[in-house]
């Protein structure tokens, strides 16, 4: 004969647990009903009665099936060098990151609770490494040969256009000036030079070796969240 | 937090040479520069260099080219400044300071290291 | 190298005074000025960069402004820990500190 399914509440089996989306009720000594995410239980189980859930109220959540007493609260709004990436709803809670030329400093376990502006490169420096949504840009004097004169969250050191009779030297924070109309090549703007180090001045000391791995150039995109612990080990 | 540790002074004879050291902590060693400063009893402050711990790679105010070598060490976080031929003018407290390359300059210092040229 | 003449040398003033200190720079140095704090027996102590940023931590009777390039060190009521060394520090082209301002208390 088949088992008989067994509705909640029910004692169960000695040395057995209880079923998904069930927990065991301590007091009642009974496997009883979780609430579903977005409720909670109002009404905790007896011997002879189910637990009783009920929906979350405004700015309130519940992401698991749980048997919590009260749902939790939504975090703060989110302040102005965030953006709302999830709003609090009655299954999940807010979520902040940080806006765009902006930097996670200190995160939470689903979102950032302190962002930081982007460093900016000074002109004579590089990006090296660019930021993340977790880390800050790394700025590094340009290479001899190549130049920054901006002061930027994302622009590389660019070569030095070659000139055939150079007006004025370039430096680590100026292109080199051309007498000619013309340079006889200037190297694509859109070619990739980071910052091995340059000083601000034309003169250097050491040869620069190349980085044993290459910084990358584009920033990362951002990380999916991850639950927050609730009153319940999940389903 | 950040800091900046120095050796302690020194006394050398006109001719020789002194290595001062700078031992960072508290920030990643290798994404900043570290300048050299120096300033003479009751005088002014004079930037000597840098060095990019990362690559090596050094800037050298005109004055020192011929005599200065910045090195630095990434596994001990530790940047070094030697100074030679040295001479009685050379005699000065010696900085070394952090600078993350934005607008932002020089946040950092050590707390300075006394180099006393004397015969 | 670009020069950076900073004034006064020395300057006497009292508590509560409202204090100048003024830097010109041989060259345009954009707004790459920065000025240091220096008390006897120690390390200098950045107040501002980039010509009106504050470091963090600095008192807001603090301020950089520019005129040209004419840098100004404001101290809009002195305290009794201002007392100290003054210099300015242009980082665009190159590197080059100012004379110094030694401010005493009258």
């Known amino acids: 004969l088949p088992a008989q399914v067994a509705f909640t509440p029910y004692a169960p089996e000695p040395g057995s647990t209880c079923r998904l989306r069930e927990y065991y009720d301590q007091t009642a000594q009974m496997c009883c009903s979780k609430c579903s995410p977005g409720q909670h239980a109002k009404v905790f189980c007896t011997k002879t009665s189910d637990t009783v859930c009920d929906s979350c109220e405004d700015s309130t959540y519940t992401q698991l099936w749980n048997w919590v007493p009260e749902c939790l609260s939504c975090g703060s709004r989110c302040s102005s060098d965030q953006v709302e990436t999830q709003a609090c709803t009655r299954e999940q809670n807010r979520i902040c990151t940080c806006r765009p030329g902006w930097y996670c400093a200190l995160s939470k376990q689903e979102g950032c609770r302190l962002c930081a502006p982007l460093r900016k490169c000074r002109p004579g420096f590089g990006v090296a490494r660019p930021g993340t949504e977790t880390s800050d840009v790394v700025c590094k004097p340009c290479a001899p040969g190549t130049f920054s004169n901006t002061t930027s969250s994302t622009d590389i050191c660019r070569p030095h256009q070659i000139c055939n009779v150079v007006a004025i030297p370039g430096n680590a924070s100026m292109d080199a000036v051309c007498t000619s109309t013309s340079p006889t090549r200037s190297m694509a703007p859109g070619a990739v030079h980071l910052p091995q180090p340059v000083s601000t001045r034309s003169q250097h000391t050491q040869p620069t070796p190349e980085p044993s791995t290459a910084p990358s150039t584009s920033f990362l995109l951002p990380m999916g969240p991850s639950p927050p612990a609730e009153g319940s080990t999940g389903d | 937090q950040v800091q900046l540790v120095q050796s302690g002074a020194e006394v050398k004879k006109p001719g020789a040479s002194v290595k001062v050291s700078c031992k960072a902590s508290g920030y990643t060693f290798t994404d900043y520069i570290i300048h050299w400063v120096r300033q003479a009893p009751g005088q002014g402050l004079e930037w000597m260099g840098w060095i990019d711990p990362d690559y090596g790679n050094t800037d050298y105010a005109d004055k020192f080219k011929k005599r200065v070598t910045m090195t630095a060490d990434t596994s001990i976080s530790t940047a070094f400044m030697e100074l030679s031929r040295l001479r009685s003018d050379d005699t000065a407290v010696y900085y070394c300071?952090?600078?993350?390359?934005?607008?932002?300059?020089?946040?950092?210092w050590g707390q300075g290291t006394l180099v006393t040229v004397s015969s | 190298d670009i020069q950076m003449t900073q004034s006064p040398s020395s300057l006497s003033a009292s508590v509560g005074d409202r204090v100048t200190i003024t830097c010109n720079g041989s060259q345009n140095i954009d707004n790459y000025l920065a000025w240091f704090q220096q008390k006897p027996g120690k390390a200098p102590k950045l107040l501002i960069y980039?010509?009106?940023s504050l470091q963090t931590g600095v008192p807001s009777r603090f301020s950089g402004s520019r005129s040209g390039t004419d840098f100004t060190l404001t101290i809009s009521s002195l305290q009794p820990e201002d007392f100290a060394t003054y210099f300015c520090?242009?980082?665009?082209?190159?590197?080059?500190f100012g004379g110094g301002t030694k401010l005493e208390l009258k």
């Open positions: 300071a952090r600078d993350e390359g934005s607008p932002l300059v020089m946040d950092a």
């Open positions: 980039s010509t009106y």
């Open positions: 520090f242009q980082y665009n082209n190159g590197y080059m």
